[in-house]
């Protein structure tokens, strides 16, 4: 796969993943009332990071925001924080990666700068994806713990004590937002990895030039007053000048063929 394709695909995959992270964060169905093996209610409860909702059999749905910060469980606060971190890093990653895309020309930005930006955006996407995955996983773990605790309470005879009125404990299970979050985090992570891989293809391979004295042979390279710096293609303002007229080459080839020069 060419560097441009890898970078472009990485960007698109990260973008989809990022959109998914935002969607998951905003969704109300992080946890939904467990309907299996439970007294069936005419009311369906579900909860998100920001509000809890109740849908009645009548179709009437009512949502209430969590209007307190101090009264909320620390784990919920942590999940919120992780998802917001994921979104913020994703936004920065997208902005950086737009400028880093090989197919977009911005001023006189050379490939080494684009490579650095691609790597930066890739790392940002990776951290964003991991942050979202951790956030969703922490919430899922919290649900599993609470689920088994309420199951234990249900069957430990709490409601069956002589003469006492039974109360039903609502159990919650995984909501759609968890699956959206896991997939979205995974896509953002994969997109970030692809950006990092693309960065390697964009990076000029300096090792081929270190401690090597070379001269351009007369028939290969036209004379430029700027000397070899101009003719090697690494000059700040000569990237797009056609230096060598020896057949069709891609921009990728331009960076990866130091053999166009005669080594001494």
């Amino acid at each position: 796969m060419s560097v441009t394709a890898c970078q472009g695909l990485g960007f698109v995959v990260s973008l989809i993943g990022f959109a998914g992270i935002i969607a998951a964060t905003c969704m109300d169905q992080w946890s939904t009332q467990d309907l299996y093996n439970n007294p069936v209610t005419a009311v369906f409860n579900y909860q998100g990071l920001w509000r809890s909702c109740v849908r009645e059999s009548s179709g009437f749905t009512e949502c209430r925001g969590y209007f307190t910060l101090l009264g909320l469980p620390a784990m919920l606060q942590a999940v919120r924080a992780l998802m917001i971190v994921g979104i913020v890093l994703g936004v920065i990653g997208i902005l950086v990666s737009i400028f880093a895309l090989k197919c977009i020309r911005i001023g006189s930005m050379d490939d080494s700068a684009k490579a650095k930006m691609t790597l930066t955006s890739g790392i940002l996407f990776i951290i964003s994806g991991i942050s979202a995955i951790i956030g969703v996983s922490v919430f899922a773990n919290m649900l599993v713990t609470n689920f088994w605790m309420s199951t234990a309470n249900m069957y430990s005879g709490m409601g069956g004590m002589g003469g006492m009125v039974q109360t039903v404990q609502t159990r919650y299970t995984f909501g759609a937002a968890l699956f959206v979050g896991w997939v979205a985090g995974g896509l953002t992570l994969i997109g970030g990895v692809m950006m990092c891989i693309a960065c390697r293809g964009l990076t000029p391979d300096d090792s081929n030039f270190k401690a090597v004295s070379y001269h351009a042979s007369g028939q290969n390279v036209a004379y430029r007053p700027g000397g070899f710096k101009a003719s090697t293609g690494f000059g700040s303002n000569t990237r797009n000048k056609k230096i060598y007229d020896g057949g069709a080459r891609t921009e990728d080839d331009e960076q990866s063929h130091p053999t166009k020069y005669d080594y001494v």
């Epitope: 009332q33 007294p39 069936v40 209610t41 005419a42 009311v43 409860n45 579900y46 909860q47 809890s52 909702c53 109740v54 009645e56 059999s57 009548s58 179709g59 009437f60 009512e62 209430r64 409601g159 009125v165 039974q166 109360t167 039903v168 609502t170």
Partner: antibody
Framework: EVRLQQSGPELVKPGASVKIPCKAS????????MDWVKQSHGKSLEWIGE????????IYNQKFKGKATLTVDKSSSTAYMELRSLTSEDTAVYYC???????????WGQGTLVTVSS | DIVMTQSPSSLTVTAGEKVTMSCKSS????????????LTWYQQKPGQPPKLLIY???TRESGVPDRFTGSGSGTDFTLTISSVQAEDLAVYYC?????????FGAGTKLEIK
């Protein structure tokens, strides 16, 4: 104005079946579930079941499973309840009722008296 | 199934009197999600279908006189008529609107002297 119009009284023989219609008007039929309630003479109310007119999904009281079948005809905005294998125990007034906030029933049909007698 | 127990089964009062009737459920009808109690009160006059009075245990249906008040939470609920009128002669039913199957109480018959 919301209206639920039920048919007149029915006299049926034991073992037979009867299908009671409930025609809704004054609101969008598919937006609200329709419930059915039984009231035997001088007795309390018994919930039979509920149907979602949008998708035909039903929830039945276990006691009436096999006895009552709830259906809808969206084109005519009519809900139906079919009662089969009728016995004298099934003699009662049957109401259709439209669900409302709090899963309560704000709108009721006038009731259909089903008398099972040979 | 949830059992709804109403008391008294009947009561006779004079016009203008205050009346309270009770309804107890075998399980809590309080939904933790919205902190609402899924209990409804109906009034049924002879030869008529039931009429909705109160839903969510305490929310009065529009058009219902304000002398009717619903209260209670969890398993114990009360319907209060602050000043009984002659037209209040009816049977009053409470209903569990939380658990399937939805269940009704046996009713409280209100008679006027």
């Amino acid at each position: 104005e919301v209206r639920l119009q039920q048919s007149g009284p029915e006299l049926v023989k034991p073992g037979a079946s009867v299908k009671i219609p409930c025609k809704a008007s004054g609101y969008k039929f598919t937006d609200y579930n329709m419930d059915w309630v039984k009231q035997s003479h001088g007795k309390s109310l018994e919930w039979i079941g509920e149907i979602n007119p949008n998708n035909g999904g039903t929830i039945y009281n276990q006691k009436f499973k096999g006895k009552a079948t709830l259906t809808v005809d969206k084109s005519s905005s009519t809900a139906y309840m079919e009662l089969r294998s009728l016995t004298s125990e099934d003699t009662a007034v049957y109401y259709c009722a439209r669900i409302y906030y709090g899963n309560s029933f704000a709108y009721w049909g006038q009731g259909t008296l089903v008398t099972v007698s040979s | 199934d949830i059992v709804m127990t109403q008391s008294p089964s009947s009561l006779t009062v004079t016009a203008g009197e205050k009346v309270t009737m009770s309804c107890k459920s075998s399980q809590s009808l309080l939904n933790s999600g919205n902190l609402k109690n899924y209990l409804t009160w109906y009034q049924q006059k002879p030869g008529q279908p039931p009429k909705l009075l109160i839903y969510w245990a305490s929310t009065r249906e529009s058009g219902v006189p304000d002398r009717f008040t619903g209260s209670g939470s969890g398993t114990d609920f009360t319907l209060t008529i602050s000043s009984v009128q002659a037209e209040d002669l009816a049977v009053y039913y409470c209903q569990n609107d939380y658990f399937y199957p939805l269940t009704f109480g046996a009713g409280t018959k209100l008679e006027i002297k």
